[in-house]
């Protein structure tokens, strides 16, 4: 008969598995089976026989099963024996990859690849790869004192970089056992790399401030950089140093704060690999009451005005007020307190009010004092410009600039300007022995010229109190200069002429230079020398003139600076008439008498009088003086016809007389032939 085993000669079993060894016979109907180990160790298994088959089952397989198992089959008197070598190994699990911590960019990390419960571990090889790059390979050839299942590890330290994100770590374990066809000789583990950045640059922003008032609110916002994005945790440091967790939000808002909320608040940015904290100290102050004094810390008050100082309290429901001066002089003002306001009215403000006034507010046990300095000034009106007289070209004049009721005097400056030019400047720096309102003046003398006309004379007064707030600190008065020029170059234009015919019209126009423009006054000189006013117009017009209009006319240019005259003689000519031709003493005289022949034209001045003696041989023009011709010792030949012609531009008139000269001898009249 024959004996067969399954497996035939060798069985490679994994520790912990169930192993069945089968022994069967052919050619023997009822064989007897027995199993033993080659060194007669315990079987550590269970035998089941069924017909021509016997099975040895070992469950679970362990080191105690690593033997050569012999199956003996007895058929009647014949024995057959066959052995199966059971060899054991252990490689039950895939490797495990462990990191010494999260992968933090730039920080070395140790990767450990562990293969658990390996036997025999001197046949183990572990490779560690990052992507396609082999980082380390190791064989475990170290010696041991016995067969055992051990966990074998390979360690590599490397520094991750951001570029490693997404790469994989591969741990590959190989157990080099000959003829191990039926089991995997290679196992591997894969871990995807996630590179982290530990939280850093943790920043806290506090709004409105780290110093807060009781009852107020604060919002604190915290941010931290890292990968993955850090979670934000807020806590407060307790007195014992421990942290009291407050919030897991980036923003922490505290409302209706109390003093006990003061302290150090900690914001911590936390992610898988680290934490980074920032602290901020909040100070919650007891809600203070505040005192405001208005109009401000100092007030400039004009003497005589009314001033109201107001003391206002915030943050106190029922304050009590008191006012005093810094030197505890009398208040000399009216106090009125109502609710959270108190007013001190000084009216009218006088020198006794020039103090620092203190408002003391009491709220519960707390007192607050606020001061206001009342500074006085007086500068009520613009300067007054006065001149000693009118401005006359070339004549000196005294200008006075007066600033009334000034205080403080030692800060006053007066400046006199003509156009852009400073004429005079004075500062009143003298000390005064008492506070008083003073009138201050600047006086100066100057000689105006025509060119000054139109220029501005400015008196500027400045009160140099820069630290006082009042308006204006500068006052000025302006006067435009008009320099008077006495009339001159007075001229008269007569149209059509100063000599004219009776009945015609005449225009006499008077022109006079001066400033202000001279006033024109026409008059006529009367025979007695007096002047008869005629007109105040520049042009004097006479219509339908009569001879009696002839005469001396006077034009006068008058202004504040003086007067200037111009005379013009007007001659009104008429046709000569009323000619009288007389002989004196008679028209009949004796030879040897003196005879005056006189021709007068009474109505017309400026006529030509021509005396002629008529004769057949021709007229003889006699030399007359003012129309009179004197014949001394008349002779007979002087008898005859005498003719007078009164002649002017307008016309002429003739008169004639016959002179009779009687001879003394014959007493004959001699008449000149006609």
């Amino acid at each position: 008969f024959k004996i067969e085993t399954t497996p035939e000669s060798r069985y490679l079993a994994q520790i912990g598995d169930s192993v069945s060894l089968t022994c069967s016979t052919t050619g023997c109907e009822s064989p007897f089976f027995s199993w033993r180990t080659q060194i007669d160790s315990p079987l550590n298994g269970k035998v089941t026989n069924e017909g021509t088959t016997s099975t040895l089952t070992m469950n679970p397989v362990s080191f105690g099963n690593e033997h050569s198992y012999l199956c003996t089959a007895t058929c009647e008197s014949r024995k057959l024996e066959k052995g199966i070598q059971v060899e054991i190994y252990s490689f039950p699990k895939d490797p495990e990859i462990h990191l010494s911590g999260p992968l933090e960019a730039g920080k070395p990390i140790t990767v450990k690849c562990s293969v658990a419960d390996v036997y025999p571990f001197d046949r183990l090889e572990i490779d560690l790869l990052k992507g396609d790059h082999l980082m380390k390979s190791q064989e475990f050839l170290e010696d041991a004192d016995r067969k055992s299942l051990e966990t074998k590890s390979l360690e590599v330290t490397f520094t991750p970089v951001i570029e490693d994100i997404g790469k994989v770590l591969v741990c590959r374990a190989k157990l080099h056992i000959d003829e191990m066809d039926s089991v995997p000789t290679v196992r591997q583990a894969v871990k995807e790399l996630q590179v982290y950045i530990s939280p850093k640059n943790t920043v806290i922003s506090v709004n409105p401030s780290t110093k807060l008032q009781e009852g107020g609110s604060v919002t604190m916002t915290c941010s931290s950089e890292g990968l993955p994005a850090p979670e934000i945790f807020w806590s407060k440091k307790l007195d014992n140093g421990n942290l009291q967790h407050l919030s897991g939000n980036a923003t922490l808002t505290l409302i209706a704060m109390r003093m006990e909320d003061s302290g150090i608040y900690v914001c911590e940015g936390v992610n898988l690999i680290g934490k980074n904290r920032k602290e901020v100290e909040l100070i919650v102050q007891e809600k203070p009451f505040t005192v405001e004094i208005s109009p401000g810390p100092r007030i400039a008050a004009q003497i005589g005005d009314s001033v109201m100082l107001t003391c206002s309290v915030m943050g106190c429901e029922s304050p009590s007020f008191s006012w005093r001066t810094q030197i505890d002089s009398p208040l000399s003002g009216k106090v009125r307190s109502e609710g959270t306001n108190s007013t001190l009215t000084l009216s009218p403000v006088s020198f006794e009010n020039e103090h620092s006034y203190l408002c003391t507010v009491t709220c519960g046990h707390k007192k607050l004092e606020k001061g206001i300095q009342v500074e006085l000034y007086s500068f009520p009106r613009d300067p007054e410009i006065e001149m000693s007289g009118g401005l006359v070209n070339g004549s000196s004049v005294t200008v006075s600039c007066k600033v009334p009721s000034v205080y403080p005097l030692d800060r006053l400056e007066i400046e006199l300007l003509k156009g852009e030019t400073i004429l005079e400047n004075i500062e009143f720096l003298e000390d005064t022995d008492m506070k008083s309102l003073e009138n201050k003046s600047l006086e100066m003398t100057f000689i105006p010229t025509i060119e000054d006309t139109g220029k501005a004379l400015v008196c500027q007064a400045k009160l140099h109190i820069d630290d006082m707030e009042f308006e204006p600190k500068q006052r000025q008065s302006t006067q435009t200069l008009y320099v008077n020029v006495a009339p001159r170059d007075t001229t008269v234009l007569v149209s059509p002429s100063s000599i004219l015919e009776e009945g015609s019209s005449v225009n006499m126009t008077c022109l006079s230079q001066g400033f202000p423009a001279p006033k024109i006054l026409w008059s006529r000189q009367l025979p007695n020398g007096e002047l008869q006013p005629l007109s105040e117009n520049a042009t004097l017009t006479l219509i339908s003139t009569k001879m009696e209009d002839s005469g001396v006319y006077l034009c006068e240019g008058i202004n504040q600076a003086g007067r200037s005259r111009k005379e013009v003689e007007l001659i009104i000519q008429v046709t000569p008439k009323d000619i009288k031709l007389t002989a004196f003493p008679s028209e009949s005289v004796k030879e040897g008498d003196t005879v005056i022949i006189s021709c007068t034209c009474g109505n017309v001045p400026e006529t030509w009088i021509i005396l002629k003696k008529k004769a057949e041989t021709g007229d003889t023009v006699l030399k007359s003086i003012d129309g009179a011709y004197t014949i001394r010792k008349a002779q007979l030949k002087d008898a005859g016809v005498y003719e007078c012609e009164s002649k002017n531009k307008v016309g002429s008139q003739l008169r004639s007389l016959t002179l009779d000269v009687q001879g003394r001898e014959n007493n004959k009249d001699y008449f000149s032939p006609e």
Partner: antibody, heavy 113, light 112 residues
Framework: EVQLVESGGGLVKPGGSLKLSCAAS????????MSWVRQSPEKRLEWVAE????????HYAATVTGRFTISRDNVKNTLYLEMSSLRSEDTAMYYC??????WGQGTLVTVSA | DVVLTQIPSTLSVTFGQPASISCKAS???????????FNWLLQRPGQSPKRLIY???KLDSGVPDRFTGSGSGTDFTLKISRVEAEDLGVYYC?????????FGGGTRLEIK
């Protein structure tokens, strides 16, 4: 420095139970097979039980199989031996060992009526 | 189970003299992988056992080179070239090839 410290020994009546502990430090506990070995009052050494590094596999001496249980906690780095149905022949100094290279100082178990 | 027999059970020596301890196994301790898991331990008075030699002849770190291990199959020997005071105690052999692991009965080394 490798250190193994046993505890839990004491006097127990036959049939009673005890649980021994061994606290390990100074090495990667989870990588090694750990054993319990006992030394009788007559100073004979006997291997009792062992547990694989991962804790999946246990082996026992025939004399204790079914009565003793070996276990480990790789987080706490502690090895245990739970003993029940104790007999007088179990009286011994029980040592915790890594391989047989490192041994603890031992804990004495006395089983006596 | 594999039985390990140690000879002698007590060994009296003089300081500075050599000493030799023998250990015989009931079957070969050669493993199929070619290794012999045979070891020597020393238990000094009042102390825990301590491994001296593993895999027949390999000295553990810190063990003086006056100790030598030898042998194969079933016969193994531990030799001390010059005995010193710190060598006194009980020497045990033990095997880790065949399950269950077993120990020898021990040899006490003492001073004459």
């Amino acid at each position: 420095e490798v250190q193994l410290v046993e505890s839990g020994g004491g006097l127990v009546k036959p049939g009673g139970s005890l649980k021994l502990s061994c606290a390990a430090s100074g090495f990667t506990f989870s990588s090694y097979t750990m054993s319990w070995v006992r030394q009788s009052p007559e100073k004979r050494l006997e291997w009792v039980a062992e547990i694989s590094s991962g804790g999946s596999y246990t082996h026992y001496a025939a004399t204790v199989t079914g009565r003793f249980t070996i276990s480990r906690d790789n987080v706490k780095n502690t090895l245990y031996l739970e003993m029940s149905s104790l007999r007088s022949e179990d009286t011994a100094m029980y040592y915790c060992a890594r391989g047989e290279l490192y041994w603890g100082q031992g804990t004495l178990v006395t089983v006596s009526a | 189970d594999v039985v390990l027999t140690q000879i002698p059970s007590t060994l009296s020596v003089t300081f500075g003299q050599p000493a030799s301890i023998s250990c015989k196994a009931s079957q070969s301790l050669l493993d199929r992988g070619g290794k012999t898991f045979f070891n020597w331990l020393l238990q000094r008075p009042g102390q825990s056992p301590k491994r001296l030699i593993y895999l027949v002849s390999k000295l553990d770190s810190g063990v003086p080179d006056r100790f030598t291990g030898s042998g194969s199959g079933t016969d193994f020997t531990l030799k001390i070239s010059r005995v010193e005071a710190e060598d006194l105690g009980v020497y045990y052999c033990w095997q880790g090839t065949h399950f269950p692991w077993t120990f020898g009965g021990g040899t006490r080394l003492e001073i004459k």
